[in-house]
């Protein structure tokens, strides 16, 4: 309706005596600005006045005067839009119809708001969900229809008369559409809050009680379930008898179904809250407890674990670990069903009672070969001593023992001899399945264990072999001894240190690297021609005539070597020198006549002097002194002398004749 | 203060049904569970059952499940229990009861006669 | 439900005894949220409603003399009341509130 002034605040306030009321409110007035603003208590309309009566409890004026008694009442709205209200404090009295009388220039208008005060706190409002089921969160709420910001309030939750735990969300409300305070608890059930009392408290901000609402939580539960079992201890003898009662503590909604599981498996046609076992048998040892479920689900009890007591039944040996390495720790353990479990044990290895072993497990820390074989056990307890059972084998393994190189020759071996050897051991476990040699070369192995060298090497000294399964054992290396030819013969200069010059005294050394065996013999050679047996050869005084090619032989009983040729070489200065005359000594004038220097000399000579009759030298140097034409008063006696690295040597005269042509005869 | 009032003594014939009543005053209703008790002459205490008047939910003991219904009403803040099918050993008296965290309160007791 | 046993059935005394009478539960009543025991003690003479005494297995209710008292925790429960007067002639009962409601046979008290 357009003629209408609009209005926005909450219908009905509610409040408590001595409490305030913030009354939230907004308008929109039909023209022009509020002139005028009168709160009225309960008015009522004076059709003879046309004017509203009532108590007047706020009054504002054009003049903007307000008496000192309305200070209780606070308009703390404006001209046009606010018309909210405040009292505080809040009496009984105040209960009722609030009237806001407004006046713009030419409209006025009568809105009336409902104030619900009462003589002592009331109380909030518990909110819970249609159904709780315990370990599902659920919130519940706690919400009073109050707020007022002048007049703080909390509300606090409890349990039992015990402040909850959970931390609870408070919010307000203070507007045009409602106001209320309102706390939300978020918290997970569980059975046992079945029944119990959950309390919003309403208190002043010193935490003052002021009213409170409760509830009793109605939790859906699963049954929970207690067992009972007789024997308590649920320790029973074959042939005994047991029973089991379940007893139900709690159960939201009502239980419908019973039943009874061993091990996780229902049993058939047990669905009472008895279970009777008549004559138990060690079969129906286990884990029992018994299930009962309502619209929930089901619950079930704890488990209580039968023993059914007997006597041990026949062992079994178990081994960890075989086969076993020799060395390693093995570890027997007896495996016997019995309760109570064995007391005593009695261990047998290949028949034979152990001594001194009477626990569960055998360690033995160091595992030998002649630990294999089989062991078995007894167990004993109270009620009885179990059967012996078959047992269980032992296999020791280890590396082939006592390897050893077996050389198949006769001896002694021969460089170039084909040898055989086999590799030997004294046991295995498990097989050897192959044999190693060292050192490694192209040699034959003609079968399993065994070795042929063929032509055998004078320096094959040692070898020796592996025998191998999982690991591989090695023998002591054996020597071969080949017997050989001394080796490596040659001639060695032992003095003097430089070139051999005539006249020196000389060493020459036969040596040899090796020989096998170790006995040997030397002989010196020159030109065929056996010179000592001595492993030197000596020369007092060398001279030129024992130059030449030398070797030595080495022999032992093997065979013989010789060195290379050696060729000895000595250094002297020109000798047997001579002067030789070519066509002859008696030369016609006008000829040429070659005179030679003949010499024997180490190195060869490197400078010729030539010298005449007078022993004047002449101006030649070479070998050889050519004169050409010759003449007659080339006649006379010449000698030479040959220059080389050690020495000078002469020779003795020579004498050229040279005679008149028959020309120069007939020009005379 | 709290009281919980409930119905004078009833005669009944075997075979037939009962009502006790059970008005509470002196706290919200809707609030707490309203239990029943029996006692038959000369025995102790047992259980019924409770009701929960806040949404009308039940529990039983297993003994009475067939015997006993309990109810509410919110509107004049009073429980019920109607016990059906009456046999001599239900003579006893039946009272109603509630908790609080920190006490109970119980009403005077209601003696149910079954005889022919 | 949890079972309750209580004994003696009855007991004779003399004014001025120590009287104890015990109350077994077949599962703990203890209340973890709170740490309480739910578990009252009631007094009951002929024709009466039953009267508390004691609740949270150990807590005086208001107004009762304090010869009476309660002790235990979890199953095991014990009421005792310290100088047997003429008026404690009833019988009395335990009752426990942890999950639905179960009460005990209870002991008759006479005096000699």
């Known amino acids: 309706d357009s003629s209408k002034w609009v209005f926005e605040h909450p219908e009905t306030l509610y409040a408590w005596e001595g409490a305030c009321v913030w009354i939230p409110c907004t308008y929109r007035a039909l023209d022009g600005d509020l002139e005028s603003f009168i709160l009225f208590h309960n008015p009522e309309y004076n059709k003879n006045t046309s004017k509203f009566d009532g108590t007047r409890l706020y009054e504002s004026t054009k003049d903007g005067k307000v008496p000192s008694e309305q200070k209780r009442v606070q308009f703390l709205g404006d001209k046009n839009k606010n018309c909210t209200l405040s009292i505080h404090p809040v009496h009984l009295n105040d209960s009722g119809q609030l009237g806001l009388r407004m006046e713009s220039k030419t409209e006025k208008w009568m809105e009336r708001i409902h104030l619900n005060v009462s003589e002592r706190p009331f109380p909030p409002h518990i909110q819970l969900p249609p159904e709780i089921q315990e370990s599902q969160e659920v919130t519940l709420t706690c919400l009073l229809n109050f707020s007022c910001y002048g007049y703080p309030i909390q509300l606090q939750w409890l349990l039992e008369g015990v402040p909850m735990r959970q931390a609870a969300v408070t919010s307000t409300s203070l507007t045009i559409k409602s106001v209320f305070t309102r706390s939300e608890l978020k918290f997970s059930p569980q059975w046992s809050h079945h029944g119990k009392i959950v309390t919003c408290q309403l208190q002043d901000a010193d935490g003052k009680f002021l009213s409170n609402d409760t509830v009793q939580l109605n939790v859906k539960h699963t049954p929970k379930l207690e067992i009972k079992v007789t024997p308590s201890d649920a320790i029973v003898r074959e042939g005994d008898s047991v029973t089991m009662t379940c007893e139900v503590s709690s159960s939201n909604p009502e239980y419908t179904t019973v039943s009874w599981l061993k091990d996780g498996t229902s049993l058939k046609k047990q669905n009472t809250f008895t279970l009777n076992l008549r004559e138990v048998t060690k079969d129906q040892s286990g884990k029992y407890c018994c299930q009962v479920s309502n619209d929930v689900g089901p619950g079930r009890s704890e488990e209580v674990f039968l023993q059914v007591q007997y006597a041990p039944e026949p062992s079994t040996v178990q081994i960890l670990h075989s086969p076993a390495v020799e060395g390693s720790q093995v570890e027997f353990l007896c495996m016997s069903l019995a309760n109570p479990l064995p007391t005593n044990y009695t261990w047998y290895h290949n028949g034979k009672e152990m001594q001194g072993r009477t626990e569960e497990k055998v360690h033995i820390p160091k595992i030998l070969p002649w630990h294999a074989g089989t062991y078995s056990c007894v167990a004993e307890n109270i009620l009885g001593t179990g059967q012996r059972g078959p047992g269980a084998e032992l296999d020791v393994q280890y590396p082939p023992k006592k390897v050893t190189t077996v050389i198949q020759n006769p001896m002694p071996i021969r460089e170039g001899d084909t040898v055989t050897l086999s590799c030997n051991y004294n046991s295995s476990n498990p097989s050897v399945t192959r044999y190693e040699w060292k050192p490694h070369g192209a040699w034959e192995e003609p079968s399993l264990g065994v070795l042929k060298i063929q032509n055998v090497g004078w320096d094959n000294t040692t070898i020796a072999c592996a025998a191998c399964n999982s690991w591989c054992s090695w023998a002591s290396p054996v020597a071969l001894n080949v017997q050989y030819a001394p080796r490596d013969v040659r001639v060695r200069k032992i003095k003097p240190l430089s070139e051999i010059h005539s006249g020196n005294s000389v060493s020459l050394q036969c040596d040899f690297s090796s020989s096998h065996p170790k006995e040997v013999q030397f002989f010196w050679e020159k030109n065929g021609r056996l010179l000592g047996k001595e492993s030197q050869l000596n020369f007092d005084s060398i001279s030129p005539e024992d130059a030449g090619s030398y070797s030595c032989w080495v022999n032992n009983s093997i065979g013989q070597t010789a060195s290379k040729a050696w060729t000895l070489e000595v250094l002297y200065a020109p000798r047997r020198l001579r002067v030789s005359m070519s066509p002859g000594d008696q030369v016609m004038e006008g000829k040429s006549a070659t005179l030679t220097c003949e010499s024997d000399a180490n190195p060869p000579v490197s400078h010729y002097t030539w010298f005449d009759w007078n022993n004047q030298s002449l101006p030649y140097h070479s070998q050889k002194l050519r004169l050409e034409p010759v003449k007659v008063q080339h006649s006379g006696a010449y000698w030479c002398q040959g220059t080389n690295s050690v020495g000078k040597g002469r020779s003795p005269l020579s004498t050229l004749t040279v005679y008149y042509s028959p020309e120069t005869i007939g020009r005379r | 203060q709290v009281q919980l009032v409930q119905s004078g003594a009833e005669v009944k014939k075997p075979g037939a049904s009962v009502k006790v009543s059970c008005k509470a005053s002196g706290y919200t209703f809707t609030s707490y569970w309203l239990h029943w008790v029996r006692q038959a002459p000369g025995q102790g205490l047992e259980w019924i059952g409770y009701i929960n008047p806040r949404n009308d939910y039940t529990e039983y003991n297993q003994n009475f499940k067939d015997k006993a219904t309990l109810t509410a009403d919110k509107s004049t803040s009073t429980a019920y229990m109607e016990l059906s099918s009456l046999r001599s050993e239900d003579t006893a008296v039946y009272y109603c009861?509630?908790?609080?965290?920190?006490?109970?309160?119980w009403g005077q007791g209601t003696t149910v006669t079954v005889s022919s | 439900d949890i079972q309750m046993t209580q004994s003696p059935s009855s007991l004779s005394a003399s004014v001025g005894d120590r009287v104890t009478m015990s109350c077994k539960s077949s599962?703990?009543?203890?209340?973890?949220?709170?740490?309480?025991?739910?578990l009252a003690w009631y007094q009951q003479k002929p024709g009466k409603a039953p009267k508390l005494l004691i609740y949270?297995?150990?807590t005086r209710e208001s107004g009762v003399p304090s010869r009476f008292s309660g002790s235990g925790s979890g199953t095991d429960f014990t009421f005792t009341i310290s100088s047997l007067q003429p008026e404690d002639i009833a019988t009395y009962y335990c009752h426990q509130y942890l999950s639905s409601w179960t009460f005990g046979g209870g002991t008759k008290v006479e005096i000699k």
């Open positions: 949270w297995a150990s």
């Open positions: 009861a509630r908790r609080d965290i920190t006490t109970f309160y």
């Open positions: 599962q703990s009543v203890l209340y973890s949220a709170n740490h309480k025991n739910y």
